[in-house]
Interface confidence: low
């Protein structure tokens, strides 16, 4: 499995789109800051088998897609940017899916690294709960956008390490 230069470009475009989605200054939302306890240890990439790392990355992309494809999300962000964001995420998920199948085979895929995947799911549950509690306010969305940018940066770094192993 080769996480190609194209995939790397997709990563950069995803981060760029996330940056451009910003609608209000983060400085006006300081009071809404929140620690979502990003499961950083799942993105260390040292102790992982390649297939495990890819599964975690795929889950990250999937959950990000789920978060930004809700009705509340489409009301908060520029539709054009969202549409482009979806396309980039889809492309990345397709690339990662191909890699998972190539690395471990179809049968094993669903059970890959369940603990790490659950950690990512719980992380996104905390984000969803925060948005609900904040009634999907513009500042809450801005805090979440900044958080997702941070987590996508970790994903990108893990993918870089995986490419170096190729």
């Amino acid at each position: 499995c080769n996480l190609s230069q194209t995939h790397s470009l997709n990563n950069r475009r995803t981060l760029m789109l996330m940056a451009q989605m910003r609608r209000i200054s983060p400085f006006s939302c300081l009071k809404d800051r929140h620690d979502f306890e990003f499961p950083q240890e799942e993105f260390d990439g040292n102790q992982f088998q390649k297939a495990q790392a890819i599964s975690v990355l795929h889950e990250m992309m999937q959950q990000t897609f789920n978060l930004f494809s809700t009705k509340n999300s489409s009301a908060a962000w520029d539709e054009t940017l969202l549409e482009k964001f979806y396309i980039e995420l889809f492309q990345q998920m397709n690339d990662l899916e191909a890699c998972v199948i190539q690395e471990v085979g179809v049968e094993e895929t669903p059970l890959m690294n369940e603990d790490s995947i659950l950690a990512v799911k719980k992380y996104f549950q905390r984000i969803t709960l925060y948005l609900m509690e904040k009634k999907y306010s513009p500042c809450a969305w801005e805090v979440v956008r900044a958080e997702i940018m941070r987590s996508l940066s970790f994903s990108t770094n893990l993918q870089k390490r995986l490419r170096r192993k190729d």
Epitope: L17, A19, Q20, S25, F27, A75, E79, K84
Partner: antibody, heavy 119, light 108 residues
Framework: QVQLVQSGAEVKKPGASVKVSCKAS????????MHWVRQAPGQGLEWMGE????????IYNENFKSRVTMTRDTSTSTVYMELSSLRSEDTAVYYC????????????WGQGTLVTVSS | EIVLTQSPATLSLSPGERATLSCSAG???????LYWYQQKPGQAPRLLIY???NLASGIPARFSGSGSGTDFTLTISSLEPEDFAVYYC?????????FGQGTKLEIK
């Protein structure tokens, strides 16, 4: 091709309101935020605010917040900017400009509408 | 509010000369959101440079942009007669979006 066509020049008295329109064509109207920028005679550019034509969400510059209202009509692909409590210093050319991604940001502008406030 | 200060206010040069226009931000601007526009009398502004250093469609290669943080520059390597106009830097890094006061490039 993308076109933004604005309404004609207006002359208003101090204290009155003005409503400027901007009709968009050549692209999917609801996909891009529309912005309003004004320019007083011989002066620089000043951003007034923006509206998301899809659901009408607006973000205004605090300098205008109490006096400006931006609306849209998706059936005619038109956005409107209404400025109330006009004063002489509001005499300016008002432009609509389309938002977008990267090189599309403010790449398209209306021709401008001159609003003159005079007693 | 991020205040953008352009210098000089007026720049008098001859065709063929190199023009360097500066834009200084009161606080740091993400370079992805620093743009340059050209405006001629009676016309709407025209996008020249986006994201600090990228040339907009149809803009000649003699225009270039650079900078980061609080200091940005627009350079015209060899002035053509049609380049004499007013130039504005613009940021949409944070609300409210702002423009510099403009630099008027005039024929010497």
């Amino acid at each position: 091709q993308v076109q933004l066509v604005q309404s004609g020049a207006e002359v208003k008295k101090p204290g009155a309101s003005v409503k400027v329109s901007c009709k968009a064509s050549g692209y999917t109207f609801t996909n891009y935020w529309m912005h309003w920028v004004r320019q007083a005679p011989g002066q620089g550019l000043e951003w007034m605010g923006e509206i998301n034509p899809s659901h009408g969400r607006t973000i205004y510059n605090e300098n205008f917040k109490s006096r400006v209202t931006m609306t849209r009509d998706t059936s005619t692909s038109t956005v409107y900017m209404e400025l109330s409590s006009l004063r002489s210093e509001d005499t300016a050319v008002y432009y609509c400009a389309r938002g977008g991604l990267g090189p599309a940001w403010f790449a398209y502008w209306g021709q401008g509408t001159l609003v003159t406030v005079s007693s | 509010e991020i205040v953008l200060t352009q210098s000089p206010a007026t720049l008098s040069l001859s065709p063929g000369e190199r023009a360097t226009l500066s834009c200084s931000a009161g606080s740091s601007v993400d370079s992805s959101y620093l743009y340059w526009y050209q405006q001629k009398p009676g016309q709407a502004p025209r996008l020249l440079i986006y994201s600090t250093s990228n040339l907009a469609s149809g803009i000649p290669a003699r225009f270039s942009g650079s900078g980061s943080g609080t200091d940005f520059t627009l350079t015209i390597s060899s002035l053509e007669p049609e380049d004499f106009a007013v130039y504005y830097c613009h940021q949409w890094s944070s609300y409210p979006f702002t423009f510099g006061q403009g630099t008027k490039l005039e024929i010497k």
